[in-house]
């Protein structure tokens, strides 16, 4: 269909807020439950941990969250699962300071990929029990569909 | 002519990751070679250690680069040289801490600019011999066109 | 109308730079006062500490700054005020060593936000007379209207 | 104290080269960066380059690519500038000046006392 | 290059008076830009580096001001040791550049 001004500049959006964090027993990571702050368009879903990719194609993906730990080195991990197997698509890391008045860093990174229909996002805290802020102005995930 | 739908939101996009970084020995900087991991578009050629510009506009830029070095400020430097001249658009800069165990830090940071026609878009740290993670989700380069 | 391949394209977008940063005497914030170093479209306007919003949509925001301060923690607040509210959309937060030599970290955030018309958008420092450093490819904001 | 003594004045034939050191003192050598600028008689101040001693590498002025050579011994914590093919406007006084590691984005904050070199037939 | 412009290049002035040495870039340098003064046969010593910050042990009657392009070094009462020449530098690109020096004298 010919398209108007209006249309043409309808980018998919999903920015994504925490609902809350949780680590399972038996393994050493934390993860992160999200609920949409702002939706346009029908392509993605958010389900638990993760977003559900309901329309192929190549997305801006990005990743924030604020840590509030001592351990050394913290970070999160965005992920997608799909097609039978799990694929790391980017990473941030920041050293953190010993002191728990200084241990207070936000993490963001961002980059563009190919999400197939039906892939799950997902952000992995690779720590058990992480100490996270889970504002959602310090913590927080998006897609933009290009 | 008229715009189907599935031509309206063709950006051209460029996802680079790592092949190698080297040091020049009369230079106190590390560049890094890279390669596509996503391409849609042939306006953006990569070529050795910079990006062709082939397609002038403006084009949003992002670039990360993950650090284990005890240098105590890392950073990157994204630069166009084009025309006669080279142009910082944009830098990330991290401090980090002195113990190796901990000096571990990604840096990101991203911009919107102008791109002419022949500019080359290089990432430059500077530093001789930096330590750096060449890993292709912690160190990467992209563009898109908007 | 029909969009022509040229006009498919044309998101409106501003990035700005740094004119000056000031303290104001009775508040423990540092605000930036800006100026367009690109710009594309008419639906955002520079206005002293402010950007503000003539075309209401879906926007992508990112700040960076870059801190030279020994204060632990560091970090900006990007806000919007409108409708007789004001409403924080992201932050960024650093923590910075101690000593002088060292304190020298760029804090980066973005996210995708709906911004109404009228709204004005400013990057808040919750610091009195925090050191910045103002250089153009260090201290930024910008927009993209997706 | 921090303190940059520099090597005493050196009179040259165009051609020759100089080799100017600059000895620190009262601070960690490998974190700083060790510029050098000269200063023509009566001129303006002009920047050459640095050496960084962390990784003994330099950074150019291109205006003086290909005739100068900075370096570093961190043993001794002192920092060499080497001025090759002199001509007679390399007339200058030297100097060494601290600059912080990562060298953009930091002032000189301290400085050598300077060295004359005359080149002259 | 980014060209440093200074003004005035000489400058008359008495004891107790306030100068005012403005410096301006040819291109945006943030405050990154230092101030040096330099007297005969001496090496230059850092006045106020970041535009605006005094050095460690510069008495405050020195001080800077300005971002971007413009920039000024402000003496609120000049003492007889004041009398020098003052440079501007930016350290924002490479190469860094200094302005051509403004020599304040006695009136």
């Known amino acids: 269909a010919v398209l108007t001004q209006k249309q043409k500049k309808q980018h998919s959006v999903l920015h994504l807020v925490p609902i809350n964090a949780t680590s399972k027993d038996d393994s050493d990571v934390t993860e992160v439950m999200w609920q949409p702050a702002l939706r346009r368009g029908r392509g993605l879903q958010a389900q638990g941990y993760g977003v559900r990719i309901q329309d192929a194609g190549v997305y801006l993906l990005y990743s924030q969250v604020l840590f509030q730990d001592v351990t050394f080195t913290m970070g999160q991990v965005v992920s997608r699962e799909g097609q039978g197997r799990q694929e790391t698509l980017f990473r941030c890391i920041r050293s953190m300071p010993s002191h728990p008045d200084r241990a207070y860093n936000s993490c963001y990174s961002a980059g563009v990929f190919h999400l197939h229909q039906g892939d799950i996002l997902s952000v992995i805290i690779p720590r058990a029990r992480a100490k996270l802020n889970l504002s959602p102005h310090g913590t927080f995930l998006g897609f933009v569909k290009l | 002519a008229v715009l189907t739908q599935k031509q309206k939101k063709q950006h051209s996009v460029l996802h680079l990751v790592p092949i190698n970084a080297t040091s020049k020995d009369d230079s106190d900087v590390t560049e890094v070679m890279w390669q596509p991991a996503l391409r849609r578009g042939r306006g953006l050629q990569a070529q050795g250690y910079g990006v062709r510009i082939q397609d002038a506009g403006v084009y949003l830029l992002y670039s990360q680069v993950l650090f284990q070095d005890v240098t105590f400020t890392m950073g990157q430097v994204v630069s166009r040289e084009g025309q006669g001249r080279q142009e910082t658009l944009f830098r990330c800069i991290r401090s980090m801490p002195s113990h190796p165990d901990r000096a571990y830090n990604s840096c990101y940071s991203a911009g919107v600019f102008h791109l002419h026609q022949g500019d080359i878009l290089s990432v430059i740290i500077p530093r001789a011999r930096a330590k750096l993670n060449l890993s292709p989700h912690g160190t990467f380069l992209g563009f898109v066109k908007l | 109308a029909v969009l022509t391949q040229k006009q498919k394209k044309q998101h409106s977008v501003l990035h700005l730079v740094p004119i000056n940063a000031t303290s104001k005497d009775d508040s423990d914030v540092t605000e930036v006062m800006w100026q367009p170093a690109l710009r594309r479209g008419r639906g955002l306007q520079a206005q002293g500490y402010g950007v503000r919003i003539q075309d209401a949509g879906v926007y992508l925001l990112y700040s960076q700054v870059l801190f030279q301060d020994v204060t632990f923690t560091m970090g900006q607040v990007v806000s919007r005020e409108g409708q007789g509210r004001q409403e924080t959309l992201f932050r960024c937060i650093r923590s910075m060593p101690s000593h002088p030599d060292r304190a020298y970290n760029s804090c980066y955030s973005a996210g995708v936000f709906h911004l109404h018309q009228g709204d004005i958008l400013s990057v808040i420092i919750p610091r009195a007379r925090a050191k910045l450093n103002l250089s153009p490819h260090g201290t930024f904001l910008g927009f993209v209207k997706l | 104290e921090v303190q940059l003594v520099q090597s005493g004045a050196e009179v040259k034939k165009p051609g020759a080269s100089v080799k100017v050191s600059c000895k620190a003192s009262?601070?960690?050598?490998?974190?700083?960066?060790m510029h050098w600028v000269r200063q023509a008689p009566g001129q303006g101040l002009e920047w050459m380059g640095y050496?960084?001693?962390?990784?003994?590498?330099?950074k150019y002025n291109e205006k003086f690519k290909g005739r100068v050579t900075m370096t570093s011994d961190t043993s001794a914590s002192t920092a060499y500038m080497e001025l090759s093919s002199l001509r007679s406007d390399d007339t200058a006084v030297y100097y060494c000046?601290?600059?912080?590691?990562?060298?953009?984005?930091?002032?000189?904050?301290?400085w050598g006392q300077g060295t004359t070199v005359t080149v002259s037939s | 290059d980014i060209v440093m412009t200074q003004s005035p290049s000489t400058l008359s002035a008495s004891v107790g008076d306030r100068v005012t040495i403005t410096c301006k870039a040819s291109?945006?340098?943030?405050?990154?830009v230092a101030w040096y003064q330099q007297k005969p046969g001496k090496a230059p010593k850092l006045l106020i580096s970041?535009?605006?910050n005094r050095d460690s042990g510069v008495p405050s009657r020195f001080s800077g001001s300005g971002s971007g392009t413009e920039f000024t070094l402000t003496i609120s009462s000049l003492q007889p040791d004041d009398f020098a020449t003052y440079f501007c530098q930016q350290y924002n690109i490479y190469p860094f550049t200094f302005g051509q020096g403004t020599k304040l004298e006695i009136k």
């Open positions: 050496i960084n001693p962390y990784n003994d590498a330099p």
């Open positions: 000046a601290r600059g912080l590691g990562y060298a953009l984005y930091y002032a000189m904050d301290y």
């Open positions: 970041s535009a605006s």
């Open positions: 291109q945006n340098v943030g405050n990154n």
């Open positions: 009262g601070y960690t050598f490998t974190s700083y960066v």
